[in-house]
Interface confidence: low
């Protein structure tokens, strides 16, 4: 009769470093001690007639175990194959280029350390959840690559590497490990330079807008812009609209920058740069400054009006030009009442690079003179009806402007000037209309003749 030696479990699968109970049993009635042959660390746990149980510990690799026993003088054996599985210790996607030009290829690289059995281990390269490549893990460490053509849609896309240890045939399921994702940044930078809009001339201590625009840029929001006037960096406000970038800054020239200068605009994206330059002349245009020897003159005094400007500037004062550019224009006058409030105009002209720049300035003269009442505006004899509404139209002039009051002779009765009022017979009489200021007094007599109201 042929007897068997059974080894249980048959062809087990266990995780790396795990332990396994193995039972060897025979139906031979006269068997001797059962032996277990293995390179693994083993321990006899229990035994009895025709059976023995062993504990195998720290099972790290695939192994074949063999049980043997002598039955009626002949050796019988039984075996079992242990399959060890282990998840990868490391799954890592190599760093991506910091910036990748759209339309050019780049390589994804994934490195996998550990993981067994290798025959069941697959490495998958992913963009988002899309599979780009699926390859078996071969060497240790396994390195898998895929070539990808960069597109605009890839900007900001996460790329990752996934391992799949397929132990489903052994009833253990699919074990998945995923690397940390890496984000790709793609870009488009046109070969054309930016469009730079800047002034041809810029006056010292004045400000002017400078615009720099570049179309066909992607992603426009990631671009860096450098705007400068000579070596002076400008504080730019950058706006993006679709694939267009516009940088706007205010250029302010300093006195030490006078002369020929350059405005520069650099747009940098993905480590590449595009540049535009424009020439500009920084100039100084002082004045014109119009001065009065006496801003407030007394009537009859002599006043000198002068107009000056910076070097190379031609000035003209009230139509009278200065002798030469850079010189002062001047005129003198005897101040009269009619000069009060008079404006003196000065125009200045500067030539910058063949262009003529013009500037004007003016000053107003004040002439101090005593009060006067214009007889033409103040009738000296008024004939009004009782119980009617009238206005006493009297106007005074003078600098400083005088106060005008009309008081009835022999009483303190005052009639309003320039304001409508109801006339009655009590208003009949002679009035002293007096204009007064710090420069004196001027009196005019006005007679009011009030005609009593007739009931007929």
């Amino acid at each position: 009769q042929e007897f068997l030696l059974r080894v249980e479990p048959q062809n087990p699968v266990l995780s790396a470093g795990g332990s396994l109970f193995v039972n060897c049993s025979t139906d031979c009635p006269s068997s001797e001690k059962i032996a277990l042959e293995t390179s693994l660390s083993k321990e006899l746990v229990a035994s009895g007639m025709g059976w023995a149980a062993f504990n195998l510990s720290n099972v790290t690799g695939n192994s074949r175990i063999l049980c043997s026993v002598y039955c009626n003088g002949s050796q019988i054996t039984g075996s079992s194959n242990i399959t060890v599985y282990g998840l990868p210790e490391r799954v890592e996607l190599a760093p991506l280029p910091p910036w990748q030009p759209v339309g050019q290829n780049f390589t994804l690289r994934c490195q996998v350390e550990g993981g067994s059995p290798r025959t069941s281990l697959t490495v998958v390269l992913l963009r988002w959840e899309e599979e780009l490549s699926r390859q078996p893990a071969v060497e240790e460490p396994a390195e898998v690559t895929a070539t990808v053509l960069a597109s605009r849609d890839d900007h900001g896309a996460p790329f990752s590497c996934r391992t799949e240890l397929d132990m489903q045939p052994q009833g253990l399921g699919l074990f998945v490990n995923t690397s940390a994702p890496r984000q790709l940044r793609t870009f488009v930078l046109p070969v054309t330079p930016p469009r730079l809009v800047a002034p041809r001339f810029l006056e010292v201590e004045t400000s002017w807008p400078v615009d720099c625009t570049l179309d066909g840029l992607f992603p426009a929001s990631e671009a860096q812009v450098y705007l400068a006037l000579g070596d002076q960096m400008l504080n730019a406000t950058v706006m993006n609209h679709g694939d267009t970038l516009t940088a706007t800054a205010t250029a302010t020239a300093r006195a030490d920058q006078e002369g020929a200068r350059e405005i520069v605009c650099n747009v940098t994206l993905g480590g590449e740069r595009r540049e535009a330059r424009e020439n500009l002349t920084v100039f100084s245009f002082l004045g014109p400054i119009v001065n009065l020897s006496e801003p407030t003159a007394h009537e009859g005094s002599t006043v000198t009006v002068s107009c000056m400007a910076g070097a190379r500037v031609q000035v003209t004062l009230d139509g009278v030009p200065a002798a030469a550019p850079g010189q002062t224009a001047q005129l003198q006058l005897n101040a009269t009442e009619s000069d009060d409030g008079r404006s003196f105009f000065c125009s200045a002209t500067l030539e910058v690079d063949g262009e003529f720049l013009h500037r004007n300035s003016s000053v107003q003269l004040r002439v101090l003179y005593g009060p006067k009442i214009d007889r033409a505006t103040c009738p000296q004899h008024l004939k009004w009806k009782d119980k009617t509404r009238h206005v006493l139209q009297c106007q005074a002039r003078g600098n400083p402007y005088p106060e005008l009051r009309c008081l009835k002779e022999g009483s303190s009765r005052e009639v309003p000037v320039g304001i409508p009022f109801f006339v009655n017979v009590t208003h009949n009489g002679t009035y002293q209309c007096q204009a007064s200021s710090s420069r004196g007094k001027y009196t005019l007599v006005v007679v009011m003749d009030i005609e009593a109201f007739s009931s007929h």
Epitope: V91, E92, N177, P181
Partner: antibody, heavy 119, light 112 residues
Framework: QVQLVQSGAEVKKPGASVKVSCKAS????????ILWVRQAPGQGLEWMGK????????TYAQKFQGRVTITADTSTSTAYMELSSLRSEDTAVYYC????????????WGQGTLVTVSS | DIVMTQSPLSLPVTPGEPASISCRSS???????????LHWYLQKPGQSPQLLIY???NRFSGVPDRFSGSGSGTDFTLKISRVEAEDVGVYYC?????????FGQGTKVEIK
């Protein structure tokens, strides 16, 4: 010395989301695992999930699956826990903690962030 | 999920006297690598939890030697040889052998 500093208290309406940050210092951020644990008022501790900052791999408690997202920014050594679809029972103090190797103990804890969910 | 059960839930103590807290798990906490990942934490009033004991019996740095841990498989104990006033708070046992990690419901230690 090892420190985990969390963001300040938050008050949220039901249905909203909250994102709590945890800035690590005093050790190499990618060498340790960051875990998130919460504690409702007067209640015990409840584990929510963990992240390995080196690989970015996460494990979440089944109870929070689909509602919690744990992330890590290695450039700033900061971990984040975002909890969405908030309800009143999510009112709790949320703690971040770190542990060295799987599956060791949580040896350092953040100061906690109180999240109040109220309409 | 592994259920961790602590007893007692409240423990009034006298300073200088010993104290003991028990923790039982619904499954063995022996990991496949042979280690047992059972830890003890203390949460003092108004503070974050702090680690006392890791892997059953190892005291964390700075933890006084009056704290000790013991046990195996599913039954574990935390002992305080002589309670001090600063030891008041809630003690939690926790396991990290199996995911999800779980905590006991806590034992509140207070001075009598």
């Amino acid at each position: 010395q090892v420190q985990l500093v969390q963001s300040g208290a938050e008050v949220k309406k039901p249905g909203a989301s909250v994102k709590v940050s945890c800035k690590a210092s005093g050790y190499t951020f990618t060498d340790c695992i960051i875990l998130w644990v919460r504690q409702a008022p007067g209640q015990g501790l409840e584990w929510m999930g963990k992240i390995n900052p080196y690989f970015g791999t996460t494990t979440y408690a089944q109870k929070f699956q689909g509602r919690v997202t744990i992330t890590a920014d290695t450039s700033t050594s900061t971990a984040y826990m975002e909890l969405s679809s908030l309800r009143s029972e999510d009112t709790a103090v949320y703690y971040c903690a770190r542990k060295e190797a799987y599956p060791d103990a949580m040896d350092y804890w953040g100061q906690g962030t109180l999240v109040t969910v109220s309409s | 999920d592994i259920v961790m059960t602590q007893s007692p839930l409240s423990l009034p103590v006298t300073p200088g006297e010993p104290a003991s807290i028990s923790c039982r798990s619904s499954q063995s906490l022996v990991h496949s690598n042979g280690d047992t990942y059972l830890h003890w934490y203390l949460q003092k009033p108004g503070q974050s939890p702090q680690l006392l004991i890791y892997k059953v019996s190892n005291r964390f740095s700075g933890v006084p030697d009056r704290f000790s841990g013991s046990g195996s498989g599913t039954d574990f104990t935390l002992k305080i040889s002589r309670v001090e006033a600063e030891d008041v708070g809630v003690y939690y046992c926790s396991q990290s052998t199996h995911v999800p990690y779980t905590f006991g419901q806590g034992t509140k230690v207070e001075i009598k």
